[in-house]
Structures are given as structure tokens and as C-alpha cells.
Amino acid sequence: AIVFIKQPSSQDALQGRRALLRCEVEAPGLVHVYWLLDGAPVQDTERRFTQGSSLSFAAVDRLQDSGTFQCVARDDVTGEEARSANASFNIKWIEAGPVVLKHPASEAEIQPQTQVTLRCHIDGHPRPTYQWFRDGTPLSDGQSNNTVSSKERNLTLRPAGPEHSGLYSCCAHNAFGQACSSQNFTLSIADESFARVVLAPQDVIVARNEEAMFHCQFSAQPPPNLQWLFEDETPITNRSRPPHLRRATVFANGSLLLTQVRPRNAGVYRCIGQGQRGPPVILEATLHLAEIEDMPLFEPRVFTAGSEERVTCLPPKGLPEPSVWWEHAGVRLPTHGRVYQKGHELVLASIAESDAGVYTCHAANLAGQRRQDVNITVATVPTWLKKPQDSQLEEGKPGYLHCLTQATPKPTVVWYRNQMLISEDSRFEVFKNGTLRINNVEVYDGTWYRCVSSTPAGSIEAQARVQVLEKLKFTPPPQPQQCMEFDKEATVPCSATGREKPTIKWERADGSSLPEWVTDNAGTLHFARVTRDDAGNYTCIASNGPQGQIRAHVQLTVAVFITFKVEPERTTVYQGHTALLQCEAQGDPKPLIQWKGKDRILDPTKLGPRMHIFQNGSLVIHDVAPEDSGRYTCIAGNSCNIKHTEAPLYVVDKPVPEESEGPGSPPPYKMIQT
């Protein structure tokens, strides 16, 4: 059997909103589901379509979706068919319409004292509630001789008089929302004694010290009164003018003339017409003083030939709004062509080099004129004055690579070394003209260099190979003072480089030849067994054909390397007692002893009363405290050699002797007793 596990149900829906009629079935066989609307199959559209077996509404339509929907499930094999419950939409909607004259039949028939009925053509479901307005003000039942039924769409004015004149509009609301009349109705019921506008004053803008004229005329039977007021409700008449309106004249026809206008005259002027009956008719006009502000500065612009560019001129603030135009070489630009003005923009189509120069944006109104220049440069691709060339640079001296180009604007030059951008530092300097200076040329500066010269129009580049002419030098220079250990084998190296591989030889400084137990092996001086006589001054000589020779002097000292005769031992001392750390070293030259405690050298001149370093190198600390605990290092050094040895010092509390212990009982640990 076909079973519905979701069924469509009747529901509220909003016009134009999403809705859903669900239908899901369970059945043993393959079931085909379709929908009926008032018995006719539903066709899918973009607005209403099946999703799965449910019917989805992207936007409910009150006309197309009214009726009864039903979901039908059919087993095409067995022919079995099941139908869901019927479902329909209660569609809520509201639609705006105009306010129309229902009675009398035409506007021409509207006379004072006749009944006028207006109808509000806003429709909706559920039935809307209506509200009427005259000149934007809500009307309520029984107000000023009009009968209004807010539930109904009709507004009856009985009898209609001039006081009912105005713009009638209506709004309505229901559960869907609110709508107001799409077109309103102007009811005009004339009363000859009411003041009627013949000529209304217009807003004016005048320049300082110029004159301004406001025209104002009313008509009525009998003729109406006309009065002018300024801002602060001050009346303006030819007999009594306010102090700031001394130059105001009211003409017989109602016009108001202001001469030599000043800023204080700017403001709102009211022309009031009063008939024998009816309300006063108030007309307003504003006098503005013309003004114009300064224009913002232009940044200079750089364009490339062949491109299309635009420069916008922001007009200055002003009243009236300033007109804007562009000039070049004193001539106003046309509105079409290759270089022309479009709106406030300067347009340069397919720029040529000849377009470069100063362009001026002008702005003007009644208050005056302003101008601002913009300098336009047409960029060109750089051309070579001098390309970088393959160069031989001497090591240790400054070297120069040239990259001289010209273009508009002045090109920027960057250099690359082995494809890496050179950033200026203490060794590299790029001059304004593009030349690269390498200060103190080094061997590894021998590589490829590339310079790139650019403007917005394009760039050019060239590269050059640098070969470094190496100077003759020791690598590394031998240490001027060196020590050799007595009775041991020793070597003293010496090596050098140059443009050609140099020859290296050793000799004694006094020119005497080397003894037979001393050999010179490719620059390494070798002592098979060092004797006291080997001490002295030696010279290493490096030479080649093109660069000559260089010399390095070395003073060799023969020494007995340091050994410790006595080393400090791990020591434990009672607090308040004296600690002795012994240290004795031997060597030639005779070594000096220094002590380091708690990671700082103990300066014998600043030791204080508790510490003392003896001539033989031993360190004594009196009245030891817990903070004296730590590692102590004995450092023995001479001009040739330095050695160190260390031991810890522990400071402990003296134990209180128990009664059972005799006076001769030994302490619980090995220690120094003083």
C-alpha cells in the first residue's frame, strides 16, 4: 500500500514569499508522484516547482496559487494510486492603488457646498483597515465636517468647502503589511475671498554688493493684504525697515528689492497673503550669498605615451555650483578630439610626448573664479648614455661600474649582483646618475653585474662582468708573536695568494740561514725538536713576478708550557673558620696565578680583609660564610700559555657536640680545621 508520511496542509502564506507543500510517501514499489491544482496537473516553473516529491514555491502568487492542491502518488506497475488531503493557501496580500474621485463624476462638477466622496483603491486580504490624510495630516471621524469611516475605503466630505482643499492620500494595513496610495488626489475648492497665489517668490543667489529681487503676488475679492517678513519675523515695509535691511524696498505690485546685499541679508524671506476669509498663505524664498572656496592642489602626473589617461578636477564648493572647464596653453579644451574635456575630467586619448605641459582647471560662479594647475609629464623609455662594461677592479680599492641613461622623468636605476638586488650599504653605493661604486673591492666581488634603468614608460638593462685583480697578500697573515714548547716538535705556517701563485720562503730576521734541524716546507717552518736557540725573529717572504714581494715578521718564543705542581682540592670548612685553597704552577716564563670564584676574577687589590692570595699562589679565606661556597678556579698563565684547574668549597655549620662524644671525637667529614 502507498502510505503518506508527509502530507500537504492548508496554511497561511504571504504574497511573494517562500512556501512549501510537503508530500512524502512510503510504498513497496517504485512510485511516481505528481501534483494537481484544482484537479489539473501542476507544471514546474522557476517560481513553483517540485523538489523531491514536495511542491516548493519561491514566491507565492495570489492569482496563480489560489485553489486546491493535492499530491498524487501512483504505482505505474500495479496501477495503485493514493491521493493526499487537499491543501490550499490563505494568501495574505496588499496592493497600492490611487485615490479617485467617486462623487461627483468629474472634478469640474466640484462646487462649494456640494458633497465630495473620495475612494481609496488599496486592496488586500485580509480586508485592510484604511486611514485618510489631508496634506499629510491624518483625518479622524467627524473631524471638521467630514465623515470618515476608517474601516471603509470611502471618504465623504459633506458639504465640501474651501477649507477642505488639499492633497488627499490614504494608507491601509492588514496582516501582510501596509501600503499607501500610489497616486493622490488634489481637491481644490475656490473661495474668492481666500488669498490665492498668482506669483510665488523664488530662491535667489546673488554676489556680495549686488541687488536681489523677490516677486510675490496674490489675488482675492476683495484684494488681499501682502506683507514681507525676514528670518526673525521682522516685518519689512517702506516706512519701517529693520536696521540690517535699510536698503530694502517693497513695490506696489508686492515685489521686494534688496540693494547692496551683505552677508547679514542672507536668509529666509516670507511673503504672506491674507484674504478677507481663510487662512494666511505663506510663501518662502531664500536669499543666498554667492560663495566659492579654494580648489585642492593637484599632484604632478606622469603618463606614458600611447595610453589614455584622465585627470578629474574636483570643483570647489560654491553657491551657485561653480562651472568647470579645462585650459591648456591659455586655450579652452574642446568637448571632443584627442585631448578634450568630459564633464569635470581632462581626457588625453593616445598620449603623445607633445601633450606634456601645464593644464589648468578653472571653476567660476557669481562669487568669482578659482584655478589650479596640474603638471603633466609624458614618460619616455630610457636611452643609453653609457652602458656598464666588463671591468678589471683592483682588490682593496674602490671600483666603479657606470649605467648612464636619459629619459623623462629622470629614470630610476637599480643594480643586481648575481641576479640579487644590491641594497646600498657600507660597501655599495649607487650615485644619482646610476653609477655603482664598490668600496674596498673584495675577491668575491668578481661576478656578473646588471643595471636596470626604468621610467613608467618602460625600462632598459645591460650587464657587465667584473674580474677582481687580487693583491699579493698573506692568507692569513702570520701571528706576529708565537710560542713554541721547549723540546717538542713545532710548525709555523705561512701562506699567501696573488694574481699569480706566489713563492714562499722563511729566513731569520738577521739574514742568517736556518739551522739544519729547521726546514722550510712550502711555506711551513718546521722545528723537529725546539731548542732555546730557536727563539728569535723570523721573516716569511711571499713573491711573484708581476707583484713583487711582501714580508711578514714573526717573533718566536721558546717556552716551557705550564703544569700545576699543586692543585686545589675539594674542601669543606666550618662556618667562621679559615679555608685554604692551594695552587702552585711552573713553566717558563714563570706563570702568574689568578683566582676566579663564583664566576668572577678575584682582583688581589680589591679582595678585602677576609681574602688573601699568597706569593706562591694559594688562596686563603678567613671567617668563611655560607655565601663563600662554590667553585674556585686557579688560573695560571704566561705569555705563551694559560691553564686552569678548579675545586669546590663547601661551608657547613659546626655540629653541636653530643655529651656522649668525647673531646677527641673526629668530625663527621674530612675538613680543614684551623
Epitope: F4, Q7, Q11, R18, Q51, S56, A85
Partner: antibody
Framework: QVQLQQPGAELVKPGASVKLSCRAS????????MHWVKQRPGRGLEWIGW????????KYNEKFKSKTTLTVDKPSSTAYMQLNSLTSEDSAVYYC????????????WGQGTTLTVSS | DIVLTQSPASLAVSLGQRATISCRAS??????????MNWFQQKPGQPPKLLIY???NQGSGVPARFSGSGSGTDFSLNIHPMEEDDTAMYFC?????????FGSGTKLEIK
Amino acid sequence: QVQLQQPGAELVKPGASVKLSCRASGYTFTTYWMHWVKQRPGRGLEWIGWIDPNSGTTKYNEKFKSKTTLTVDKPSSTAYMQLNSLTSEDSAVYYCARGDSNYDYFDYWGQGTTLTVSS
Amino acid sequence: DIVLTQSPASLAVSLGQRATISCRASESVDNYGISFMNWFQQKPGQPPKLLIYAASNQGSGVPARFSGSGSGTDFSLNIHPMEEDDTAMYFCQQSKEVPFTFGSGTKLEIK
């Protein structure tokens, strides 16, 4: 107006069965589905299942499938829920609720039957 | 099963102020472009009462101060302005798929 009437309380012994009733009035009984919901203090609300009074079609929460049987009597517009093999865990308030078959929301609820399973 | 997590567990709001209750689903409860999320109010000793269905539609006779919003997995119930009578437990419930599940509830009180 729509009303769903349920007995106030039922007291049954563990292991026994009970059949809770829900009598509908104020609307067409076969147009809406009837849902059953369990509520225990501190445990929130649990949906048990629904029955379509028109076709007798049922849909259960897998958790309650072996415990529950939903039936209707169309002439009396009454829905029933039978609970078997009762334990203290079945002690709760059981509500019947009218359900919209399209959106499956429960718009009207019975006052609930308090079921106490105790020896 | 779709799990609904309500927050906060309890909430105190001054009269006239706005109360907002959130409900997050472990997976989307949207289908056919509709969010199948409903909200209920329950007072002590009474059955739950439908406030909102399909995420944002008001139940019959429900005051306009109750409104619902959200889609996918995140939903909220707003009450503004808060009134004395709104003190109750509030539950969200998904009806996208069986088994229909409820949130654990939010207790709303007057501050």
C-alpha cells in the same frame, strides 16, 4: 475550539501494560496527525511517534518502537498509545499533540497524563 | 539523530528589555529552502505552547513580541519587550527529520 482531553493520571505496576487515551474535539480529527511526547523531570521532552488518523499510518522514534503502539478510533475521534513491559523509567508525563502534516509543528497539546509505574 | 543545544540554560531579563535565546543544531535543519525549527513555551504544570514554526512564522494567537530567526544550524528566539507573563521554560524543536528532537530548554525569569 480545538481541545485534546487526556486523563490526569495512571498508576500501574512494573511489568504491566497501559493504554493512554487522547480525545480530540473542535476540528476534523482525520485532517491532522497526532503526535505523542514524553516528559520526565530534568530530562526534557522526547518525541515518541505520530499516527495519521485517516490511514492509520504510524512513524516511531526508534528508541520507543518496541515499547509503544499507536492506534486511533475514528468514530470517537480518540487516539491511543499503549505502553508495554513498564518499568520505573516509563514514569513520566505523556502528552498528545496535534501535528501539522506539512511542517510537523505541534499547534495544540493535551494537558498530559502523569504515568506512575510503582509496585 | 539531530542534537539541539540551547543557550543559555537560564536567563534573567528586566521588564521591557529584550530576551534572546539561541539554539544550535548538530546539522542543518533546512530543506526545500525552509528551516524546520519550531519554538515552544512551557509554564509549570502546563503543556508546551507553540510560539514559532518554520523558524520565523508566528503560531496562532501568539503576541507580536515573540519573533524567530536563523537558518541552517543557528537559530534564535527574541522576546521584546519582556513582560511579566513571559516567565517560563522555552524549548526549540526540529521537524526536519525523524526522530523529531527538542532542545534541553532555557529558563527565562524577570530580573
